[in-house]
Amino acid sequence: MNGRVDYLVTEEEINLTRGPSGLGFNIVGGTDQQYVSNDSGIYVSRIKENGAAALDGRLQEGDKILSVNGQDLKNLLHQDAVDLFRNAGYAVSLRVQHRLQVQNGPIGHRGEGDPSGIPIFMVLVPVFALTMVAAWAFMRYRQQL
């Protein structure tokens, strides 16, 4: 398969309260059942209607959950991760990694497990434009003196 997928990766702390419909989401992944190749992380696979996650609105399907109430989810068996959530109590703090797809192009291919960053030109172009605007403003300011 040709084509390149690039991602803007952001992290967020999401605090949820287990409501009458629970936290209301499902997970996949773990060291014994990898969801992404070369990545044993825990991912959100489904968000249920009327659950705390759906009502809050920030957690998205495909998000990677890094920690629960400060406890790291790295290198956990799937069932151990499930148990961690189920025993997390009423108030649950999630550290979450969102991956926003920012570009598709026919340049090579990155593996699913590579949380590759934003393309360099997408950083350089705005920086260059900002520099040019600042230089132009500076020159006009000098001319007025």
């Epitope: 629970g22 936290l23 996949v28 059942q33 489904r46 799937h78 069932q79 189920r86």
Partner: nanobody, 127 residues
């Protein structure tokens, strides 16, 4: 195409035993667990027992604890429900189900919507 086929249902006297089987065909590599649900006339389908596909973790609803045993044979892609000490209130159509993820909520929140594949059901009648 994933298919779940149940067998082993039937008519049994109170106190008797039955063993239900559920044979899965098709790709099951991404399954996280399998379960048995039951539904009696006029009632909602309810989760009876669940077994994780890899870890051997099991769940039983309170009313069947100590009487029913869920087990799986990964090599045969088959899940079993051994039902002992059957009671008239166990009468229902029993459905096999498979899930491709796990709910993060306790079992009392888990229901039909957490399972992705279903069998056609097998009737269990306890007289």
């Amino acid at each position: 195409e994933v298919q779940l086929v149940e067998s082993g249902g039937g008519l049994v006297q109170a106190g008797g035993s039955l063993r239900l089987s559920c044979a899965a065909s098709g790709p099951s590599m991404n399954w996280y667990g399998m379960a048995w649900f039951r539904q009696s006339p006029g009632k909602e389908r309810e989760l009876v027992a669940d077994v994780s596909w890899s870890g051997g973790s099991t769940y039983y609803r309170d009313s069947v604890k100590g009487r029913f045993t869920i087990s799986r044979d990964n090599a045969k892609n088959t899940v079993y429900l051994q039902m002992n000490g059957l009671k008239p209130e166990d009468t229902a159509v029993y459905y096999c189900a498979a899930r491709t993820s796990s709910s993060v909520d306790p079992w009392n929140y888990v229901g039909v919507g957490d399972y992705d594949y279903w069998g056609q059901g097998t009737q269990v009648t306890v007289s």
